[in-house]
């Protein structure tokens, strides 16, 4: 099966790599613009230069192209806790990330929020915190894992998942509750 090509890709495939077909004259292949520039005007004829101009501040192109305008630089989402790792240049978009000891939680393919890595208090680190994943904790005896935090078994109710982990403690607590003074 041949993958479906858009009109632009179909037209480009007529020309050798690094060139595109002139939009008004399909017998002319124009040289694409270098990254960091955009297409201001198509080449006037075969073997003549394409008129490429440098992207202005706040915009970029990251690869060779024949875009009529540069792409707007991304802005890091402060409300999501993001910080700028590297600023936008004419040939590279802004790189956003999280602070040290934080990880990215992706709400969608391109949107992430920064959260603090769990410290595994009352437990041990099973897997260290990574760029896109929180620390995985293993809890000490008498504690169970809830939302990646080690919580005392005294907070475990029979209806919750923790009952298996905290079974001896629950029986203990239950016994204490039942024994009244005579």
């Amino acid at each position: 099966l041949v993958p479906h090509l858009g009109d632009r890709e179909k037209r480009d495939s007529v020309c050798p790599q690094g060139k595109y077909i002139h939009p008004q004259n399909n017998s002319i292949c124009c040289t694409k613009c270098h990254k960091g520039t955009y297409l201001y005007n198509d080449c006037p004829g075969p073997g003549q230069d394409t008129d490429c101009r440098e992207c202005e501040s706040g915009s970029f192109t990251a690869s060779e192209n024949h875009l009529r305008h540069c792409l707007s630089c991304s802005k890091c989402r402060k409300e999501m806790g993001q910080v700028e790792i590297s600023s936008c240049t004419v040939d590279r978009d802004t790189v956003c990330g999280c602070r040290k000891n934080q990880y990215r939680h992706y709400w969608s393919e391109n949107l992430f929020q920064c959260f603090n890595c769990s410290l595994c208090l009352n437990g041990t680190v099973h897997l260290s915190c990574q760029e896109k994943q929180n620390t995985v904790c293993t809890c000490h005896a008498g504690f169970f894992l809830r939302e990646n935090e080690c919580v005392s078994c005294s907070n475990c109710k029979k209806s919750l998942e923790c009952t298996k982990l905290c079974l001896p403690q629950i029986e203990n607590v239950k016994g204490t509750e039942d024994s009244g003074t005579t």
Epitope: H22, P23, Q24, L39, N41, D42, P44, D51, E54, E56
Partner: antibody, heavy 118, light 108 residues
């Protein structure tokens, strides 16, 4: 010989519209970027808008973005500037200019005066 | 945007003298995309110099341009009576294209 002839200027009230035309001859019109540049009375030159040879790319000064539209008809060798929501500060002589390939404005028309006043 | 500042605002000289006009850019002009235009009263501008130092077609060799980056100069080696006019520098490397405010060369 390259010739550029502007028309369509005149007196218009604030908020009004006007369409300027520029008839070009003496060169292969469709391969060159064409532009509009204006000059307020007694002032310097201000670039307004440009359009690529194919008409696919258009570029505007912030002062006119969203109000002015540049277009061209390569079959008629004519450049246009549709000006809407005109303001007093748009009063100027509007020049049509040809851009040299990869270059500056190498030929200018004689200009057409646009006056925005009530 | 790139702001172009021309100096002096007015230059009062006699025919036969040398004129030196300056144009300073607020940031580097890419690939020396700088031009000089001449405008006489009631007329359209005329291109003199492009690419910082190349003379346009039909421009006499008494006009010369130099400079790169942020500092550019237009020199008229010997002023002729028809050279008294306003001169504008223009950059066309970074959108929006911008002009200097102009230098008027007047007869002393």
């Amino acid at each position: 010989e390259v010739q550029l002839l502007e028309s369509g200027g005149g007196l218009v009230q604030p908020g009004g519209s006007l369409r300027l035309s520029c008839a070009a001859s003496g060169f292969t019109f469709s391969t060159y970027v064409m532009s509009w540049v204006r000059q307020a009375p007694g002032k310097g030159l201000e670039w307004v808008s440009s359009i690529s040879g194919s008409g696919l790319g258009s570029y505007y000064a912030d002062s006119v973005k969203g109000r002015f539209t540049i277009s061209r008809d390569n079959s008629k060798n004519t450049l246009y500037l549709q000006m809407n929501s005109l303001r007093a500060e748009d009063t100027a002589v509007y020049y049509c200019a040809k851009e040299a390939h990869r270059g500056p404005f190498d030929y200018w028309g004689q200009g057409t005066l646009v006056t925005v006043s009530s | 945007e790139i702001v172009l500042t021309q100096s002096p605002g007015t230059l009062s000289l006699s025919p036969g003298e040398r004129a030196t006009l300056s144009c300073r850019a607020s940031q580097s002009v890419s690939s020396s995309y700088l031009a000089w235009h001449q405008q006489k009263p009631g007329q359209a501008p005329r291109l003199l110099i492009y690419g910082a130092s190349s003379r346009a077609t039909g421009i006499p060799d008494r006009f010369s341009g130099s400079g790169s980056g942020t500092d550019f100069t237009l020199t008229i080696s010997r002023l002729e009576p028809e050279d008294f006019a306003v001169y504008y520098c223009q950059q066309y490397g970074s959108s929006p294209w911008t002009f200097g405010q102009g230098t008027k060369v007047e007869i002393k």
